[in-house]
């Protein structure tokens, strides 16, 4: 494998990780796929000091992270365990709503204006963060 | 200057396989997504297949799914689709396509697969 | 999937001419456009991308614009070397990247 030892252009080091921050909007699913095909994934929030770093960057704009609950209980797109990870909801959330008329409820998280986190419908075209772990061996396939 | 040349194009029987290459240079190829696009004879672009900069990450259009692989050798500089149960509708161009910011931003020349008995 | 229906199929076109190609997506994509000159037996070109960019290397006569589900590419002054077939892509949601169905440029 290859090890990455510095951020790509135009990415934001932090605390041996690299951040990519979006100006256009796109669906969750999007929005993982388009960090995927960078070797990254959705920013996934771990710490009070990650979540100030990213709150800066994005400033007051609703913005994907790489939480969801698509398929039952909540989880970060790396596997990090949410239910003893770090969590930064708004009072009353995540609340699943069904009132929005859209069909189903609410399973993506966002940032929300204040920072703090709301759960939503997926397809919303919101801003998005990708996150990609300096140091870490990138298993590249061995070729067929 | 960004440069794409692929190779490995040709003739090939209905249910056959074949394995596509494509040369790059004047880039940072480990660091860039690359894509496969076809064009059947004339007719129009149809995207393939795509791959993260490691090769890690993979995506494939419905029509090629579980028959093609995209591959790539960062050490090599070159992206690879190799092509199996090869079908009468396949016959194309093909096209390598480097991506930035998700969209193909430099094109090879292609190289012409044909898929005939 | 993201279906882009591009318009005209094909016109016809005299030296000098202004003309407008439009791309319609079946749903929002931002600016998430690109447009691609093509001539025959030769890879596509990328001419404009986010949309209203003009690649680098690009004459000033090609322009974007539109945002949303409708899109525009302009030639504002028909050279002889424009004539060829122009693609509309999204990349907005993938997979998969989404093609218009081409626009052939010819002389009238």
């Known amino acids: 494998g290859s090890e990455r030892t510095c951020c790509p252009v135009n990415w934001v080091e932090h605390e041996r990780s690299c951040y990519w921050f979006s100006r256009s909007g796109k669906a969750w699913a999007d929005a993982d796929n388009y960090c995927r095909l960078e070797d990254a994934h959705l920013v996934v929030v771990t710490s009070w000091e990650e979540q100030k770093f990213v709150q800066h960057h994005i400033g007051p704009v609703n913005t994907w992270m790489g939480l969801h609950d698509q398929n039952g209980p909540w989880k970060w797109v790396d596997g990090t365990d949410y239910e003893t990870g770090f969590k930064n909801w708004r009072p009353e959330q995540p609340d699943d709503w069904y009132g929005h008329g859209l069909g189903g409820g609410e399973d993506c998280a966002h940032f929300t204006d204040d920072g703090r986190w709301n759960d939503d419908v997926c397809q919303r075209p919101y801003r998005w963060v990708c996150e990609t772990e300096l140091d870490k061996a990138s298993q590249e396939p061995p070729l067929l | 200057e960004v440069q794409l040349l692929e190779s490995g194009g040709g003739l090939v029987q209905p249910g056959g396989s074949l394995r596509l290459s494509c040369a790059a240079s004047?880039?940072?190829?480990?660091?860039?997504?690359m894509s496969w696009v076809r064009q059947a004879p004339g007719k129009g672009l149809e995207w393939v297949s795509a791959?993260?900069?490691?090769?890690?990450?993979?995506f494939y259009a419905d029509s090629v799914k579980g028959r093609f692989t995209i591959s790539r050798d960062n050490s090599k500089n070159t992206l690879y689709l190799q092509m199996n149960s090869l079908r009468a509708e396949d016959t194309a161009v093909y096209y390598c396509?480097?991506?930035?910011?998700?969209?193909?931003?430099?094109w090879g020349q292609g190289t012409l697969v044909t898929v005939s008995s | 999937d993201i279906q882009m229906t591009q318009s005209p199929s094909s016109l016809s076109a005299s030296v000098g001419d202004r003309i407008t190609i439009t791309c319609r997506a079946s749903q929002g994509i931002g600016n998430d456009l690109g447009w691609y000159q093509q001539k025959p037996g030769k890879a596509p070109e990328r001419l404009i991308y986010a949309a209203s960019s003009l690649q680098s290397g690009v004459p000033s006569r090609f322009s974007g614009s539109g945002s949303g589900t409708e899109f525009t590419l302009t030639i504002s002054s028909l050279q002889p070397e424009d004539f060829a077939t122009y693609y509309c892509l999204q990349h907005n949601s993938f997979p998969p990247w989404t093609f218009g169905q081409g626009t052939k440029v010819e002389i009238k």
């Open positions: 396509a480097k991506l930035e910011l998700g969209i193909f931003d430099y």
């Open positions: 791959t993260s900069g490691s090769g890690v990450n993979t």
């Open positions: 004047g880039f940072t190829f480990r660091s860039y997504a």
